[in-house]
C-alpha cells in the first residue's frame, strides 16, 4: 500500500508511518514501527505533559517561589501543571502568576469596588456624591454620609468625597 501522507487524530507521521501519540502524562521513548506500538513512558515526579504528544521530555512543574510571594493553589499531576497563587495581601503580576505584588490600597476619596484576589488587584472607584472615604485601604468601600436628619440634627459642614458631613444641633432661633 501507498505510504500515508496524513494520519488520524492522536497519531503523527514519521518516516512514512502513522504512529500513535503518547497520552497526556506520558513522554515519547521511541517511534512506532510496522511491528511495534509507539513506546511511551510516564512522566516522573514533578513533571507533566498535558496533551497527546510526541515530546521526548516532560515539562517541569512550575515552582511557586515563596520568595516571590507565591504559594501552591493546586498541586500539579502528571497531566497538569502546578497552579500558583499569591500569599494573602498580594496578587499576581501576570496571568502566568510568576511573581506577586502587594494589593493596591484605595486613597482617600476612593473606595474599594472589588476586593483583590490572589490573581487580581484591588479595583477602586471614586466616591460619588453622598459617599466618602477618609482612609487609604484595600478593603474599605465608600461610606454614605451621615444622615443628620435622622438624628434630628442639621448639617453644619458639608461632606466631601474624603470627609463625612458634620452634624450639629438645630438652630432654635429659626424656629
Amino acid at each position: 500500500p501507498e505510504p500515508p501522507t496524513a494520519c488520524r487524530e492522536k497519531q503523527y507521521l514519521i518516516n512514512s508511518q502513522c504512529c500513535s501519540l503518547c497520552q497526556p502524562g506520558q513522554k515519547l521513548v521511541s517511534d512506532c514501527t510496522e511491528f511495534t506500538e509507539t513506546e511511551c513512558l510516564p512522566c516522573g515526579e514533578s513533571e507533566f505533559l498535558d496533551t497527546w504528544n510526541r515530546e521526548t521530555h516532560c515539562h517541569q512543574h512550575k515552582y511557586c517561589d515563596p520568595n516571590l510571594g507565591l504559594r501552591v493553589q493546586q498541586k500539579g499531576t502528571s497531566e497538569t501543571d502546578t497552579i500558583c497563587t499569591c500569599e494573602e495581601g498580594w496578587h499576581c503580576t501576570s496571568e502566568a502568576c510568576e511573581s506577586c505584588v502587594l494589593h493596591r490600597s484605595c486613597s482617600p476619596g476612593f473606595g474599594v469596588k472589588q476586593i483583590a484576589t490572589g490573581v487580581s488587584d484591588t479595583i477602586c472607584e471614586p466616591c460619588p456624591v453622598g459617599f466618602f472615604s477618609n482612609v487609604s485601604s484595600a478593603f474599605e468601600k465608600c461610606h454614605p454620609w451621615t444622615s443628620c436628619e435622622t438624628k434630628d440634627l442639621v448639617v453644619q459642614q458639608a461632606g466631601t468625597n474624603k470627609t463625612d458631613v458634620v452634624c450639629g444641633p438645630q438652630d432654635r432661633l429659626r424656629a
Epitope: N15, S30, D31, C32, T33, E34, F35, T36, E37, E39
Partner: antibody
Framework: QVQLVESGGGVVQPGRSLRLSCAAS????????MHWVRQAPGKGLEWVAV????????YYADSVKGRFTISRDNSKNTLYLQMNSLRAEDTAVYYC??????????WGQGTMVTVSS | EIVLTQSPGTLSLSPGERATLSCRAS???????LAWYQQKPGQAPRLLIY???SRANGIPDRFSGSGSGTDFTLTISRLEPEDFAVYYC??????????FGGGTKVEIK
C-alpha cells in the same frame, strides 16, 4: 529489569521438529514486535522471522519460509518459533530480540539448536 | 534486498588506539535506519548505535556512528580492553529481510 530468556533448544535429527520459546519480562510485551535471529557456529548474524505486537503481521527469511512459524501468546508474555523439517544448515544459536525504531534493542542469551543424525 | 558489506573483516589494534569500521549498503538505507551491534564470544549482540549516529542507553561516548545513504562508519575513539569484539551493522528499515553485515572483528594487536 527488561529480560528475554530463550529455551527449547537441543539436538534433533534432520527432518524432525522443535519448538523454541522466548519468555519476556520487565516490559509491556504486548506492545512490541519480536524477532528471531540466528547465528551458525563461527558465522555472522542471520535474521529469521518477525511478528507484530498483536500477532497479525509475520515475515520470514527465504531460507526458513514454509518450514518455520513464528507466533506469540501475549497472555503468557511468550514468543515461539516452531521449526519443522529441520536441516543441518539450521544448526545455530537462536536469539529472540525486541523490535523498536532503534533496532533490536534487547536480546536474549540464546538457545543452541543442533541438527544432526 | 539490501546487502551490507563490512570492512575490514579483521582490525588488529592496541588499546588506546582509534578504530574505524565501515559498513557499505548496496542501496540507500531508508531514514538512516542503520544500527551497530557489539558481540563478545559466548554473548548475545548488544545494541550500540541506532539511526546511524545515536548512542543507545548506557553506551560510552567513545563509540560514535556517522554516515547516511550507503556509507556508514562506526568509530571507537580510544579502544578499551573490553571493546575487543565483533561488530555488526544492520539495516532495520528495508525489510523483509532485516539484513546484517558480515561483521568486523576488532582484535588485540
Amino acid at each position: 529489569q527488561v529480560q528475554l530468556v530463550e529455551s527449547g533448544g537441543g539436538v534433533v535429527q534432520p527432518g524432525r521438529s522443535l519448538r523454541l520459546s522466548c519468555a519476556a519480562s520487565g516490559f509491556t510485551f504486548e506492545k512490541y514486535g519480536m524477532h528471531w535471529v540466528r547465528q551458525a557456529p563461527g558465522k555472522g548474524l542471520e535474521w529469521v522471522a518477525v511478528i507484530s505486537y498483536e500477532g497479525e503481521k509475520k515475515y520470514y527469511a527465504d531460507s526458513v519460509k514454509g518450514r518455520f512459524t513464528i507466533s506469540r501468546d501475549n497472555s503468557k508474555n511468550t514468543l515461539y518459533l516452531q521449526m519443522n523439517s529441520l536441516r543441518a544448515e539450521d544448526t545455530a544459536v537462536y536469539y529472540c530480540a525486541r523490535d523498536t525504531s532503534r533496532g533490536h534493542d534487547i536480546w536474549g542469551q540464546g538457545t543452541m539448536v543442533t541438527v544432526s543424525s | 534486498e539490501i546487502v551490507l558489506t563490512q570492512s575490514p573483516g579483521t582490525l588488529s589494534l592496541s588499546p588506546g588506539e582509534r578504530a574505524t569500521l565501515s559498513c557499505r549498503a548496496s542501496q540507500s538505507v531508508s531514514y538512516s535506519y542503520l544500527a551497530w551491534y557489539q558481540q563478545k564470544p559466548g554473548q548475545a549482540p548488544r545494541l550500540l548505535i541506532y539511526g546511524a549516529s545515536s548512542r543507545a542507553n548506557g553506551i560510552p561516548d567513545r563509540f560514535s556512528g556517522s554516515g547516511s545513504g550507503t556509507d556508514f562508519t562506526l568509530t571507537i575513539s580510544r579502544l578499551e580492553p573490553e571493546d575487543f569484539a565483533v561488530y555488526y551493522c544492520s539495516d532495520y528499515a528495508d525489510y523483509p529481510p532485516f539484513t546484517f553485515g558480515g561483521g568486523t572483528k576488532v582484535e588485540i594487536k
